[in-house]
Interface confidence: low
């Protein structure tokens, strides 16, 4: 009696069970009563990642440099290319179909978290006692110079954008 279900890694066709093609191979001919399933390996730039009966392999995803992407992991006959953003960019979506440049933190703000391949730079305002005088995607807020530790007097207080300005101690306080 013809089978109604087949074992794992088999498929039912013409009332008989045929072997699926292994990952990295595509189906050319179904099996017959006297021949095994005929499979062929995927070509360069193609892949199939499961036991299958596909007649065409899938194309490797193209990591388009014009969209800011690069290959993080080259695809094989059983895996797809993995695209990530080039340095200095992050994904515009979870699928990472394109990338945009990282944002910089303006003067008065420091980097709280450096951007990754999937998230943008996170900035924070410089708290009292700290400053940032540059626009940067990497620099944190830096502490004001403590003039007294250098034996100097503070001539101008620091702000969120500028460091304290030190000068010579007045010998006589008038």
């Amino acid at each position: 009696e013809p089978p109604t279900a087949c074992r794992e890694k088999q498929y039912l066709i013409n009332s008989q069970c045929c072997s699926l093609c292994q990952p990295g191979w595509k189906l050319v001919n179904d099996c017959t009563e006297v021949t095994e399933t005929e499979c062929l390996p995927c070509g360069k730039g193609e892949f199939l990642d499961t036991w299958n009966r596909e007649t065409h392999c899938h194309q490797h995803k193209y990591c388009d440099p014009n969209l800011g992407l690069r290959v993080q992991q080259e695809g094989t006959s059983v895996t797809d290319n993995i695209c990530v953003c080039k340095e200095g960019r992050h994904c515009t979506s979870k699928a990472c179909e394109s990338c945009v440049l990282y944002h910089s933190c303006s003067p008065g703000f420091g980097v709280k978290q450096i951007a990754t391949g999937v998230s943008d730079t996170i900035c924070e305002p410089c708290p009292v006692g700290f400053f940032s005088n540059v626009s940067s995607a990497f620099e944190k807020c830096r502490p004001w110079t403590r003039c007294e530790t250098k034996g100097l007097a503070e001539q101008q207080a620091g702000t969120d954008k500028t460091d304290a300005v030190c000068g010579p101690q007045n010998r006589l306080r008038l």
Epitope: K44, G45, P65, R70, V71, Q72, Q73
Partner: antibody, heavy 120, light 112 residues
Framework: QVQLVESGGGVVQPGRSLRLSCAAS????????MHWVRQAPGKGLEWVAV????????YHADSVKGRFTISRDNSKITLYLQMNSLRTEDTAVYYC?????????????WGQGTLVTVSS | DIVMTQSPLSLTVTPGEPASISCRSS???????????LDWYLQKPGQSPQVLIS???NRASGVPDRFSGSGSGTDFTLKISRVEAEDVGVYYC?????????FGPGTKVDIR
Amino acid sequence: QVQLVESGGGVVQPGRSLRLSCAASGFTFSSYGMHWVRQAPGKGLEWVAVISYEESNRYHADSVKGRFTISRDNSKITLYLQMNSLRTEDTAVYYCARDGGIAAPGPDYWGQGTLVTVSS
Amino acid sequence: DIVMTQSPLSLTVTPGEPASISCRSSQSLLYSNGYNYLDWYLQKPGQSPQVLISLGSNRASGVPDRFSGSGSGTDFTLKISRVEAEDVGVYYCMQARQTPFTFGPGTKVDIR
């Protein structure tokens, strides 16, 4: 700027082993594939091996397959070529080179090379 | 393996004159993304190779615009519009279409 400095070359007898190193600087080493290419004295360039950025994929030329192994240590920012069962025909200058990636596949920056001489 | 051939194997050029080197591959280097995986390198005397052209026609950064690459499939050409004394050396084409990557035999360019 990108810099690649090979070391470990020298004179070695046939059948012996040698390990070449390539110290990288000036770029994010862990983001790039890396190659070894060799050049026998007075001859042309011969591609030897390539390794993907995180070591999952490596390919070797048939002439060295089973004898040479390309590897990398991203924490040390260094590329290696372990050469076993050396033959006289392996005598060459060995260059390490960075792969340009999807936008420029193939070696884009090259080191100055290290000479390996296999002789009895 | 893909076999690369070059012609001529030797070339002597007058400064200021154009020069052209041909490279052929035994299989197509055109990939489904529309790019040709063919690079050109120059190895100056006593130096390491340097990339001139990648993906058939993309000039590498810092390469003078007198160098240009063209062609598709199996036939490629490197042109130097006006040869200068510093252009002497051996020019290699290389296919990056599939492993093993393979180089052409090289074309030695001298100045007359």
